[in-house]
Interface confidence: low
């Protein structure tokens, strides 16, 4: 069915850029300016995403694609395609509804976006501090007593951080 | 950078057909339009039609509609513009023009070809 | 399709201000904002001054800026220099999917 009614269809033959012109019998029609169409057979062109304000433009639209959008410098993007940008915050810190502050006790944040994380528990692996934690940086666990045979590794590296809201795989 | 470079000048007789060329380089050719605008001598601006580089589909001035053609060859990044039934009111200048992508301008122009109509 | 009605000529001195008015229909001028204008020296292609009523492409001086009320876009170039002597036509988009141009002004700096 699908296959017969491509064969009939005037208005599969419009390529990407162009829109089936319902007022023009039909006629494949550039789109407008200012919009797009990104698949062939499309009765109407999309409006170009306008990168205004604090977002900037990372791909300029096009007759067959969006426009892309990232961030001016001191924001980040979230979400899917950048649908937002969120302030960027120092090393050390993170963001909350009363903007930067820097990360409590105990916890750390390495990047400039995300939240403050919990130093790694050296004694739940039977391990010691190496290095001990700041702001910025986990600590470094070293090794337990038991470890020091000949060949072993020194130093135990940090387990890797995790995105918030991502559960470990 | 960004050049859209016309053919050479015509002469042709009433009746004839002429087929202007502009090869554009310097931008992704098949994420724009390319519009053709004629100018006759001591006269203003006349918009012609659009061609879409990529799809080749095309709008038309209803004033040509029947007389012009417009396509394009994407491996060579070059649109065409064929005008039949030639008559002396069509000797002009004939511009390519690049559609302004998310705008209804024309950022870029050839530099013209001439084409005159003469018995 | 008819043309949008320009003025066939203005002029003005080095340093005043001159506006050259482009007047359509609600399916040009009136009824989008794509609204452009053109300077067209002797010989010359026309150059795209500004785009969409009122944006300046780089490299475009800031003398020149341009508006829209109703069915009426209007080009202003403050500061008149003799080199801004020269054709300007203004353009838009219409509802045919099509465009149009204006009759054109020539710009006379005294």
């Known amino acids: 069915f699908e296959r017969t009614r491509s064969l009939q269809d005037p208005c599969s033959n419009c390529p990407a850029g162009t829109f089936c012109d319902n007022n023009r019998n039909q006629i494949c029609s550039p789109c407008p300016p200012n919009s797009f169409s990104s698949a062939g057979g499309q009765r109407t062109c999309d409006i170009c995403r306008q990168c205004k304000g604090v977002f900037r433009t990372r791909k300029e639209c096009s007759s067959t694609s969006n426009a892309e959008c990232d961030c001016t410098p001191g924001f980040h993007c979230l979400g899917a395609g950048c649908s937002m940008c969120e302030q960027d915050c120092k090393q050390g810190q993170e963001l909350t509804k009363k903007g930067c502050k820097d990360c409590c006790f105990g916890t750390f944040n390495d990047q400039k976006r995300g939240i403050c994380r919990p130093w790694t528990n050296c004694s739940l692996d039977g391990k010691s501090v190496l290095v001990n934690g700041t702001k910025e940086r986990d600590v470094v666990c070293g090794p337990s007593p038991a470890d020091l045979s000949p060949g072993a590794s020194s130093v135990t590296p940090p387990a890797p951080a995790r995105e918030p809201g991502h559960s470990p795989q | 950078q960004m050049q859209l470079v016309q053919s050479g000048a015509e002469v042709k007789k009433p009746g004839a057909s002429v087929k202007v060329s502009c090869k554009a380089s310097g931008y992704t050719f098949t994420s724009y339009y390319l519009h053709w605008v004629r100018q006759a001598p001591g006269q203003g601006l006349e918009w012609m039609g659009i061609i879409h580089s990529s799809g080749g589909s095309t709008t038309y001035a209803q004033k040509f509609q029947g007389r012009v053609t417009m396509t394009r060859d994407t491996s060579t990044s070059t649109v065409y513009m064929e005008l039949s039934s030639l008559r002396s009111e069509d000797t002009a200048v004939y511009y390519c023009a690049r559609g302004y992508f998310g705008s209804g301008s024309f950022d870029y122009w050839g530099h013209g070809t001439l084409v005159t109509v003469s018995s | 399709q008819s043309v949008l009605t320009q003025p066939a000529s203005v002029s003005g001195s080095p340093g005043q201000s001159i506006t050259i008015s482009c007047t359509g229909t609600?399916?040009?001028?009136?009824?989008?904002?794509?609204v452009s204008w053109y300077q067209q020296h002797p010989g010359k292609a026309p150059k795209l001054m500004i785009y969409d009523v009122s944006n300046r492409p780089s490299g475009v001086s800031n003398r020149f800026s341009g508006s829209k009320s109703g069915n009426t876009a209007s080009l202003t170039i403050s500061g008149l220099q003799a080199e801004d002597e020269a054709d300007y036509y203004c353009s838009s988009y219409t509802s045919s999917s099509t465009y149009v141009f204006g009759t054109g002004t020539k710009l006379t700096v005294l």
């Open positions: 609600s399916s040009d001028v009136g009824g989008y904002n794509y």
